[in-house]
């Protein structure tokens, strides 16, 4: 499959946009050095490739957007892995370098004669990739060549830093916002003691750092924080689960700033160790409402509360996608491989026939079966439209009164394109306004999802709330059937009247033992007992002292 990575999807045009999608899963630990990618992906891969191809068709047939200019693309596979994505980005850059040299008349053959070789058009911008860690690596390269990058799901806070990532923009908000949303959920249910897990890599690390910082300010204690790679082996996930179990029964809630495949790894370990139902997972948007995370492990995932970027399904994409067939879809070079993987059958007589499948694919197969649209489809399409609107605005200002590419726009100047992109403001695919702040970020709107058992062996994600620019709304009755069902995740119970908290050395502030004050002491504050002065005694509620009334003894009084 090493050669599979070199496969590229092309669509011709006057201006070429690059794209990086995770057409295949990332390499497993043992295959990383070979950069050998995993199995083909539908939602994160094939659907995004098709979204790019079809969205460009729609843009090209829209007479009001870039009239007389055809947009084309070059789509490459990132395999959700930095090394693979960098290798592919170098290919984008190489195209740009060759064509810019050609513009300057520098393309010469070895024997000195002029070249009739017509190089590929340069890439003017790049859509993607999905992962923050990978996006950072790609941006480090692209910005050296002034190539703007628009991400559709890379949400790391680090990417907001324009001194480091000048040519990076995104149609999604920064993770600082969802970290806040997660803390708000923890606060709502009075979970003061939680375990924390994050995916190793930028998305998880920066997100969890923000979650921990915000938690500390809100008096929420982290029992322990763990990190793990998405592609870690079974044993690593087992060890992590055993560590999380060591904080039970106190830390029932596990906040997971994780990629979807990390969550899946946790669920699989729960199955292997017989731990279904022992934890409540609070997951970030890496999990969201993805079925590929929970498939086969629904029992372990039940009760999970997740954050999902607000993005409704795109109907016109489904209308296009569900009609696709391997006999007619030749422009997507990964489609035959995907079809065989999706239906576990062999496309007999096709160039990419896979002999590992015994069953032959029949003609009645359709993508309508168990179809689930990629939850980030709207963002992928908005990122492509952003690039188109940026180019459109640039054309309007550089080529006034001219339809098509004028000389002033050739070759496309990345600096001017970035300027134009940052000013972009249009109505997105779901009717929301797409705009960018000074950091190239988009505003934060999230849905809160809850993974529930809806009937016998039927599970689904239910929308139970929203978080919009700092305001959390939750339907508590939908999450918990009754108040008493609300999970407790606390280290220590409140102390009773007349007791103070004693925090053991090295323990977090949420864990204490309750000690009663002495007979002549009152509770000065939650950590201190103070003795009443001579002649006074603790009040009934033990919060202060009252003077002892003076009683004078008379000769005839009986003995007390």
């Amino acid at each position: 499959q090493s050669s599979e990575r070199r496969v590229v999807a092309h669509m011709p045009g006057d201006i070429i946009i690059g794209a990086l999608f995770s057409v295949h899963h990332q390499p497993t630990v043992d295959k990383v050095h070979e950069r050998k990618c995993g199995a083909v992906r539908e939602q994160y891969g094939i659907q995004r490739v098709e979204a790019m191809l079809h969205t460009l068709e729609r843009i090209n047939s829209d007479p009001t957007l870039l009239p007389n200019i055809t947009l084309g693309c070059e789509i490459r596979d990132s395999c959700w892995h930095s090394a693979v994505a960098l290798e592919q980005s170098i290919e984008f850059i190489r195209d740009s370098l060759i064509s810019s040299e050609e513009e300057e008349g520098l393309v010469r053959c070895v024997d000195g004669s002029s070249s009739s070789f017509r190089s590929k058009k340069p890439i003017v911008g790049v859509i993607g990739p999905g992962s923050s860690s990978v996006a950072i690596q790609v941006q480090n390269l692209l910005q050296l060549f002034n190539i703007p990058q628009i991400a559709y799901s890379a949400t790391s806070m680090d990417l907001s830093d324009k001194t480091l990532f000048k040519y990076f923009m995104r149609v999604v908000p920064s993770d600082a916002q969802q970290a806040r949303a997660m803390v708000d959920i923890v606060k709502r249910y009075n979970w003061t003691y939680v375990s924390a897990v994050h995916t190793e890599g930028n998305y998880g690390e920066s997100g969890m750092e923000a979650f921990k910082d915000m938690s500390a300010k809100e008096g929420i204690c982290i029992a322990h924080s763990y990190k793990i790679y998405s592609n870690a082996g079974e044993q690593s996930f087992d060890k992590l689960l055993k560590k999380l179990t060591s904080h039970l029964p106190k830390a029932r809630v596990v906040a997971c700033f994780c990629e979807g495949m990390t969550v899946r790894g946790l669920l699989m370990a729960m199955r292997r160790l017989g731990l279904a139902g022992e934890f409540l997972l609070l997951g970030s948007d890496g999990w969201a409402d993805r079925y590929d995370v929970t498939d086969g492990y629904q029992r372990e995932a039940v009760g999970g509360i997740t954050i999902k970027l607000q993005s409704p399904d795109v109907k016109w994409f489904d209308d296009y996608y569900l009609k696709l067939r391997p006999e007619t879809n030749h422009r997507n070079p990964w489609f035959q491989e995907f079809w065989q993987h999706r239906f576990q059958c062999r496309l007999e007589g096709f160039p990419q026939e896979n002999s590992k499948y015994n069953k032959t694919c029949n003609s009645s197969l359709t993508l309508k079966t168990h179809h689930v649209q990629d939850s980030k489809m709207g963002f992928v399409i908005n990122a492509i439209y952003s690039m188109a609107y940026g180019l459109h605005n640039m054309q309007m200002s550089l080529c006034p009164g001219y339809a098509g590419l004028c000389d002033a726009m050739k070759p496309i100047d990345g600096r001017k394109l970035l300027e134009s992109l940052m000013k972009t403001n249009f109505t997105g695919v779901s009717g929301d306004t797409i705009l960018f702040d000074e950091n190239g970020d988009s505003p934060g709107r999230y849905e809160i999802m809850n993974f529930k058992e809806m009937g016998k062996d039927y599970f689904d994600y239910i929308n139970v709330g929203s978080w919009d620019n700092g305001e959390l709304k939750m339907d508590d009755d939908e999450v918990w059937s009754k108040k008493s069902n609300i999970i407790r995740s606390v280290c220590s119970e409140p102390c009773e009247k007349g007791q103070i908290k004693v925090i053991r050395k090295g323990e977090v502030s949420c864990c204490w033992t309750c000690t009663p004050c002495k007979e002549n002491e009152y509770v000065f504050d939650e950590y201190t007992c103070k003795a009443c002065q001579l002649g006074s005694w603790p009040t009934d509620d033990l919060t202060g002292c009252d003077l002892i009334p003076v009683q004078y003894l008379r000769w005839g009084d009986p003995e007390p």
């Epitope: 079974e234 029964p249 292997r272 017989g274 279904a276 139902g277 022992e278 029992r299």
Partner: antibody
Framework: QEQLVESGGGLVQPEGSLTLTCTAS?????????MCWVRQAPGKGLEWIAC???????TWYANWAKGRFTISKTSSTTVTLQMTSLTAADTAAYRC??????????????WGQGTLVTVSS | ALVMTQTPSSVSAAVGGTVTINCQAS??????LAWYQQKPGQRPKLLIY???DLASGVSSRVKGSGSGTEFTLTISDLECADAATYYC????????FGGGTEVVVK
């Protein structure tokens, strides 16, 4: 002192049903350790039947036990095992056991003495 | 389903000697294996967990080793009190016991 005591065993007719009870003393169910049933036919080896989480009431069964055996928590100190469609092959000493750690798949740290179930006409 | 195969079914050794019992798992269970000792009419007693960790109160003459699918229990300096049946238990993706090994001390 931590202790598990089983009761409810006895002679039962083939195709009959029986409910066994395990009563825990000196054990705090809130610690989260799972309660399980293991049986041992006369002169034979140990055979795991089922486990239950005292926290979630989730249950785990050996494949052969699904459908005929039901483990449940009836109070904060008792766990039962309901057995139906019994055959001679189910004749065994049924023991209650507590896991060493939280989770259905764990070593068994504490065992009951067992209650004998005899299936015979 | 997880299946544990224990060998031999019976072994005898003299006082002061050593016995070795093997246990094989039908799938990789890493180190998720326990060993028990059971004497007639008594409940099983946990000796080893996580393949090699000694349970509290167990003599250091008892040693567990192995990982993956192959495991071994070794009892050295045999005493008369070691005469019992020993069981292995795999606890990974299920619970399963081996058939048992009877240890006779001469």
């Amino acid at each position: 002192q931590e202790q598990l005591v089983e009761s409810g065993g006895g002679l039962v007719q083939p195709e009959g049903s029986l409910t066994l009870t395990c009563t825990a003393s000196g054990i705090d169910f809130s610690s989260g350790y799972f309660m399980c049933w293991v049986r041992q036919a006369p002169g034979k080896g140990l055979e795991w039947i089922a486990c239950i989480s005292p926290y979630s009431d989730n249950t785990w069964y050996a494949n052969w036990a699904k459908g005929r055996f039901t483990i449940s928590k009836t109070s904060s100190t008792t766990v039962t095992l309901q057995m139906t469609s019994l055959t001679a092959a189910d004749t065994a000493a049924y023991r209650c056991a507590r896991t060493m750690a939280i989770g259905a798949y764990n070593p068994f740290k504490l065992w009951g003495q067992g209650t004998l179930v005899t299936v015979s006409s | 389903a997880l299946v544990m195969t224990q060998t031999p079914s019976s072994v005898s050794a003299a006082v002061g000697g050593t016995v070795t019992i093997n246990c094989q798992a039908s799938q990789n269970i890493y180190s998720n294996l326990a060993w028990y000792q059971q004497k007639p009419g008594q409940r099983p007693k946990l000796l080893i967990y996580d393949a090699s960790d000694l349970a509290s109160g167990v003599s250091s003459r008892v040693k567990g080793s192995g990982s993956g699918t192959e495991f071994t229990l070794t009892i050295s300096d045999l005493e008369c009190a070691d005469a019992a049946t020993y069981y292995c238990q795999g606890y990974y993706s299920g619970n399963a016991f081996g058939g048992g090994t009877e240890v006779v001390v001469k």
